[in-house]
């Protein structure tokens, strides 16, 4: 598991990974199945209306390890986790949303409190 | 040096079923797909599919899906693809190939010759 | 799925002489991580294919640098500066962005 404070640079993968894509399947994905040389994520967020929605999909290396970090975006309520050790590992990932009122969110620094997984097996 | 071994010449009867093997040597077996792929006289290369050997997954040609099945033996380092119900059309060099992103390393191919 | 046109399909050349060989994709290489998965091979008589370029312009190990590879998008060639006679065979491009994978038809080349 990978803690908030770690900046450990991701690092390229000998292999193309395959990841289920919902609401989130590029142009090159096939079967709500996309590749990549990054991530497999899954991701939770609430919609305008406040309504959770759950997407899926693959993220690319370049970028991918601080959109994997999950750091907390004022007034917006939104959970990713991501991962890596096997092909279409992100079916198996669960984000929750955030409390609603969270002073650890608003206030103080950045602790330990995310539900994410960011593996790093290569 | 990464290689990848496949046996000499098959020869089969129609209706028969075989499978085709492709040890690799040279590297982490674990660390790159195996791709297979089917190559006729005068009629190119034809991409039949891959398996990952760190989880078993695969990914099929939609041509020749029921055709082939892909399997691997991560303890000895081998890749196997079946083909069954052949027929003259099967009649074919099959190669196995290291894939990253791209096939890097090919095996020398097996010819199968199916006739009664 | 992806078609992959190569021409020449035959390509006399006398040794020394530059050689060029064009491969089209029916649709864009381009793959969302931004890589473009297009890929060249030289295939001689009785043998396996070889890599030779990879990712449109990569000389893989061991190539040498007569060989080159350039292009984006859809249109992609391979270019051999001064032939020799060791690189007769059959060359193809390959993609693999879009499953299935696919080649091109194969271009020959031999001598004039």
């Known amino acids: 598991k990978k803690e908030d404070g770690e900046s450990t640079a991701p690092t390229a993968r000998p292999k193309v990974l395959r990841c289920k894509c919902h609401h989130h399947c590029p142009e090159d994905s096939v079967n709500n199945i996309c590749s990549t040389d990054g991530y497999c994520f899954t991701m939770i967020e609430e919609d305008d209306s406040g309504t959770p929605v759950v997407t899926s999909g693959c993220l690319g290396l370049e970028g991918s390890d601080f959109q994997c970090r999950d750091t907390p975006i004022p007034h917006q309520r939104r959970s990713i986790e991501c991962c890596t050790e096997r092909n279409e590992c992100n079916k198996d990932l669960h984000p929750t949303l955030p409390p609603l009122k969270d002073r650890d969110f608003v206030d103080g620094p950045i602790h330990h409190k995310h539900h994410h997984h960011h593996h790093h097996h290569h | 040096q990464v290689q990848l071994q496949q046996p000499g010449p098959e020869f089969v009867k129609p209706g028969a079923s075989v499978k085709l093997s492709c040890k690799a040597s040279?590297?982490?077996?674990?660390?790159?797909?195996v791709q297979w792929v089917k190559q006729r006289p005068g009629q190119g290369l034809e991409w039949i599919g891959e398996?990952?050997?760190?989880?078993?997954?695969?990914l099929y040609n939609q041509n020749f899906k029921g055709k082939a099945t892909l399997t691997v033996d991560t303890s000895s380092s081998t890749a196997y693809m079946q083909l069954s119900s052949l027929t003259s059309e099967d009649s074919a060099v099959y190669y196995c190939?290291?894939?990253?992103?791209?096939?890097?390393?090919w095996g020398q191919g097996t010819t199968l010759t199916v006739s009664s | 799925d992806v078609v992959m046109t190569q021409t020449p399909l035959s390509l006399p050349v006398s040794l020394g002489e530059q050689a060029s060989i064009s491969c089209r994709s029916s649709q864009s290489l381009v793959h969302s991580t931004g890589n473009t998965y297009l890929h060249w091979y030289l295939q001689k008589p009785g043998q396996s294919p070889k890599l030779l370029i990879y990712k449109v312009s990569n000389r893989f190990s061991g190539v040498p640098d007569r060989f080159s590879g350039s292009g984006s998008g859809t249109d992609f060639t391979l270019k051999i500066s001064r032939v020799e006679a060791e690189d007769l065979g059959v060359y193809f491009c390959?993609?693999?962005?879009?499953?299935?994978?696919?080649f091109g038809s194969g271009t020959k080349l031999e001598i004039k």
């Open positions: 190939a290291r894939f990253g992103f791209y096939v890097d390393y």
């Open positions: 398996i990952d050997p760190s989880d078993n997954y695969t």
């Open positions: 390959s993609q693999s962005t879009h499953v299935p994978f696919t």
């Open positions: 040279g590297y982490t077996f674990t660390s790159y797909w």
